[in-house]
Every structure is written in structure tokens, then in C-alpha cells.
């Protein structure tokens, strides 16, 4: 912390301007009031201060504002916003898009990870749902973020939003998050025929259930191995052979690469030698021929 | 040491069909899908299609999809292609090729010699 | 489908130069592309794959280069024997397409 000195007279701060970069750090925290520095926060990045000395403001900026700083501070920022801590953002209350567009820019190319999604977070809190604005702001500014969010705050996009989502802002995201978006896409893309249904629906898949997967093998839809890798494990587990023969099309002859990995590895172990043969590409690992499977987590549950 | 060994030579007539083998050895015949791939003269190489070995499904470029037809005789491991309404254009060389699934869906390590079907009246 | 652009068509270079062949795909192809060289009434012998792997017994001269959609086949010293059709194949998709190949001839 600055240690705290009066401020010389000639020294004293009416305005905020360029003056204030030769300013050593305990002139600025004597000399600068809070409350102009507030007042004045569409000025301070235009100043080259050093990060020492963005310090120094912030530190100002807590003290003034110690349950969190309003908008009209938050909006202008500019470079101080890379001296938040996710915890100062916490306390924040955001609601204007010109807000997050303009803290979006100034993060790009700094590891700010942490306080974008935290940021983003305060805007979905403050704006009550992730509506299409939104959607559409994140898209544009932070192609990505979208994943940054709690499966929690994900639950408030509506279905009408999910069509301004793009393939490349779903791949960071998890499969919690995409078992929260995939039941909306599924209602948002539910109008739209077999193949212009598959295209929209690859990216969410993720979180699709085993018998959405069962139905898609029905549909001629030729699932690529890279969206088939992506599935659940426990979608995949149930399906047959034919099911998956099916589903990929010529794709299939792609398992053969991930017969190793999951979920193609846990899903070998559990299909029958025989059947696994029927694929030409001696995938092995099946349930040898003759044998019984006995499920006995069933026999627990009942007992 | 795997081998494909192609059927000889044919020549045809324009509007009949021709029926090409590739007999494999050396390897587990029905653990890699074999494919077919031709080139016509002057022409660069162009893929016509595949098929599964083990239960003989086929998948064909969309360009000879309704004249081509792709077998396997997994008895004398042995694959065929056969290619109906020929044309003059049809005229060339026509390999088999098996796929080594290193990565992706695999790229092709194995040939074979080519046969050569000639399509004139 | 997965289109494969293969330029030059054909080229003449002296013994020693270095020849540089390019590929462009119709879309990204994740490295999944394999060099051929053609002679006539061979079969065609696989050189690269995975964009720079070269095969066992090939000579070091040959090599490759690329990401994405782009990809480059390079002869570091072109020797009489080089003489052939050069084809790329992309397998990133299990629809396999070749590149319209390159005649490489010694002036």
C-alpha cells in the first residue's frame, strides 16, 4: 500500500490529464481525489501511465467504491480493467454490451482468462438471461467465451438464441455445458429437415443422450469421427455395431485410428468379437464369441 | 510381404461392362478396406470408391456411383470392381490400393500392378 | 467433397534445381495429406504422409510442408530419376481425392 503524504500545493489535481505522468506514485495518491478520478475516467487511458501508477488508481478507485465500482466507471476503464483481479470484478454490476465490447478489446492479447469469464458472468447476472445481443456481442469480440460461462448461467439462454452460436464458439466448452445447450438446440433447430438438422446440431452433441444418437444413425446423416469422438461415453456405450455403422457411414473406416481412445476404446470392449469383425478394419478387444455377459450392476440395484 | 495382384488386361466394347480382380496376400485380408482408384490417359489419378472386406459395403464416388459396383470373395481374398456402360472415356488404368490407418483414414501404402481396360468399338 | 488444387500442372527444371509443388484444399485438412510419384506403367509409390513423414527408403531430398489448407512437396536437388507425375491426397475425409498431379521434366 501507498504510504499516505499531504499533497504539495503546487502539485494539486483539478483535472485528469497528461501532467499527471510525472506524478511519482505517493504524488498521485496524495494528490488525486477519488472522486474527480471517477468523474474523469473517460480521459485516463488516453494517458500513457505506467502500470505502477495504474496502481496507484485503482487503489483510489477501491477505496471510493469498496462494495464495487458503478458502470459509469466500469465503461471506461480501459487499460486499469488489466489490473482486476476476478474478485474485484465480482462486485461489479454490468448490464451495457458497450461496456463488455469495450473491457473485451482492452483483455485481447493479455491472459485475462479468468476475469473475461467473470465479466461475462456480471453481464448475464445483470442483463437477468444470455439473450441474443448478448450471444451475438461474445461471438463477435470473445469467439470462445461463451464456454467461459457456468453451465448455471448457460441454462438461461433461450432456444431462439442458440441459432447466432457458431461451431468455433462451442469448442472449449465442456460436457457440462453442452448437456445444458444441446436439449435447447435441439428445440431451436427442430423445424429444419435431416441434413440441414445434422449440420446445426454437430456442434451440441456433445451433450446428446444415447437415444438422440440412436436416432441420428437412422437419418443417412454420415457423422464425421471428429464430432463421433466428441459424444459422451455414455451415449456411445449402448450402441450396436450396425448402430454405429450406420451413424458414420464411410466414416467408419476412421475407428480403426481411434481404437485406442475414447469413447471408440470403451465402446470396442463392449461389442462382441463377431460383430466388431463385420467392420473390415480388425478392430479387436471385443467380447470373445461364446461368451455370456452378465449385467450385474442390475442384480445390485435389485438387491 | 503384402501383395495385390490384379487381373490382365481387357478390352471392350462401348455400352458392355468389364469386371476387375485384385487378389490379396499377405496380410488379414478382411482387416483393411480395399479401395479403387484409376487413371485415365492424360488424366491424374482418380478415386473411385471402397469397400468394407469383411461384410462387402461399398462406398462410391458420387461420379461412377450408378455405374460401378464394388464385391469381395473373402473365401479367395479377392476384391472386384466392376464398371458397367462403358464409354470411351472409360478407357484406363485401373488400380486396387489398400489403406494403412496410421492416422485420420488412412493413406494408401500398397498397390496394385494396374490393369489396363481399353473401351473401343 | 474435399477438393485438392495441385499447381504447377507441369515443370521443367534442371538436374540439381529445387523444385517446390504445391497443394490447396477446399477446405482445412488437418495435415492429412500424402505425396505420390507416378511413372508410367507403375503403380504409384507413396513418398510422404502426414504432410512431412517420409516413407522408409525414400531419399531425404524429398520432404514436405503445411497446415491447414496449404501444403508444400519439395525436391531439395532434382535428379534424372525424379522424373514422374506427382500426385497429393488429402485423407482427412474418408471420400479420398488426389491433386490433378504434377509432370515434372528435366530441360
Known amino acids: 500500500d501507498v504510504e499516505r503524504t499531504t499533497c504539495p500545493p503546487e502539485k494539486e489535481v483539478h483535472e485528469i490529464d497528461e501532467s499527471l505522468i510525472f506524478y511519482k506514485k505517493r504524488e498521485l495518491e496524495a494528490c488525486v481525489d477519488a472522486a474527480l478520478l471517477a468523474a474523469q475516467m473517460d480521459r485516463v487511458d488516453a494517458i500513457p501511465f505506467t502500470y505502477e501508477q495504474l496502481d496507484v488508481l485503482k487503489h483510489k478507485l477501491d477505496e471510493l467504491y469498496p462494495q464495487g465500482y458503478p458502470e459509469s466507471v466500469i465503461r471506461h476503464l480501459g487499460h486499469l480493467f488489466l489490473k482486476m483481479s476476478p474478485e474485484d470484478i465480482r462486485k461489479w454490476n454490468v448490464t451495457s454490451l458497450e461496456t463488455l465490447k469495450a473491457l473485451l478489446k482492452v483483455s485481447k492479447g493479455h491472459e485475462m482468462s479468468a476475469q473475461v469469464a467473470t465479466l461475462i458472468d456480471r453481464v448475464v447476472v445483470g442483463r437477468g438471461q444470455l439473450d441474443k445481443d448478448t450471444v451475438d456481442t461474445l461471438t463477435a469480440f470473445c469467439p470462445g467465451c461463451l464456454c467461459s460461462l457456468s453451465p448455471e448461467r448457460l441454462s438461461s439462454v433461450p432456444p431462439s438464441v442458440i441459432g447466432a452460436v457458431r461451431p468455433q464458439d462451442l469448442d472449449t466448452c465442456g460436457p457440462r455445458q453442452l448437456d445444458v445447450l444441446y436439449p435447447k438446440a435441439r428445440l431451436a433447430f427442430q423445424n429444419m429437415s435431416g441434413s440441414e438438422y445434422f449440420v446445426k446440431i454437430r456442434p451440441f452433441l456433445g451433450g446428446a443422450p444415447t437415444e438422440d444418437v440412436k436416432a441420428l444413425s437412422q437419418q443417412n446423416v454420415s457423422m464425421d469421427l471428429a464430432t463421433f469422438m466428441k459424444l459422451r461415453r455414455e451415449a456411445v456405450l449402448p450402441l450396436t455395431v450396425a448402430e454405429v455403422q450406420k451413424l458414420l457411414g464411410p466414416h467408419v473406416e476412421g475407428l480403426k485410428v481411434e481404437e485406442q481412445h475414447s469413447p471408440v476404446r470403451d465402446w470396442i470392449l463392449k461389442q462382441r468379437q463377431d460383430d466388431l469383425d463385420t467392420l473390415g478394419l480388425g478392430l479387436q478387444g471385443g467380447i470373445p464369441n461364446g461368451y455370456l455377459i452378465l449385467d450385474l450392476s442390475v442384480r445390485e440395484a435389485l438387491s | 510381404e503384402v501383395q495385390l495382384v490384379q487381373s490382365g488386361a481387357e478390352v471392350k466394347k462401348p455400352g458392355a461392362s468389364v469386371k476387375v480382380s485384385c487378389k490379396a496376400s499377405g496380410y488379414t485380408f478382411t482387416n483393411y478396406w480395399m479401395h479403387w482408384v484409376r487413371q485415365a490417359p492424360g488424366q491424374g489419378l482418380e478415386w473411385m470408391g471402397n469397400?468394407?472386406?469383411?461384410?462387402?459395403?461399398?462406398y462410391y464416388n458420387e461420379r461412377f456411383r450408378s455405374r460401378v459396383t464394388m464385391t469381395v470373395d473373402k473365401s479367395t481374398s479377392t476384391a472386384y470392381m466392376e464398371l458397367s456402360s462403358l464409354r470411351s472415356e472409360d478407357t484406363a488404368v485401373y488400380y486396387c490400393?489398400?489403406?494403412?490407418?496410421?492416422?485420420?483414414?488412412?493413406?494408401?501404402?500398397?498397390w496394385g500392378q494396374g490393369t489396363t481396360v481399353t473401351v473401343s468399338s | 467433397d474435399i477438393q485438392m488444387t495441385q499447381s504447377p500442372s507441369s515443370l521443367s527444371a534442371s538436374v540439381g534445381d529445387r523444385v517446390t509443388i504445391t497443394c490447396k484444399a477446399s477446405q482445412d485438412i488437418n495435415k492429412y495429406i500424402a505425396w505420390y510419384q507416378h511413372k508410367p506403367g507403375k503403380a504409384p509409390k507413396l513418398l510422404i504422409h502426414y504432410t512431412s513423414e517420409l516413407q522408409p527408403g525414400v531419399p531425404s531430398r524429398f520432404s514436405g510442408s503445411g497446415s491447414g489448407r496449404d501444403y508444400t512437396f519439395t525436391i531439395s536437388s532434382l535428379q534424372p530419376e525424379d522424373i514422374a507425375t506427382y500426385y497429393c491426397l488429402q485423407y482427412a475425409n474418408p471420400l479420398r481425392t488426389f491433386g490433378g498431379g504434377t509432370k515434372v521434366e528435366i530441360k
Open positions: 469397400i468394407n472386406p469383411s461384410q462387402g459395403g461399398p
Open positions: 490400393a489398400r489403406p494403412y490407418y496410421g492416422s485420420s483414414y488412412g493413406y494408401f501404402d500398397y
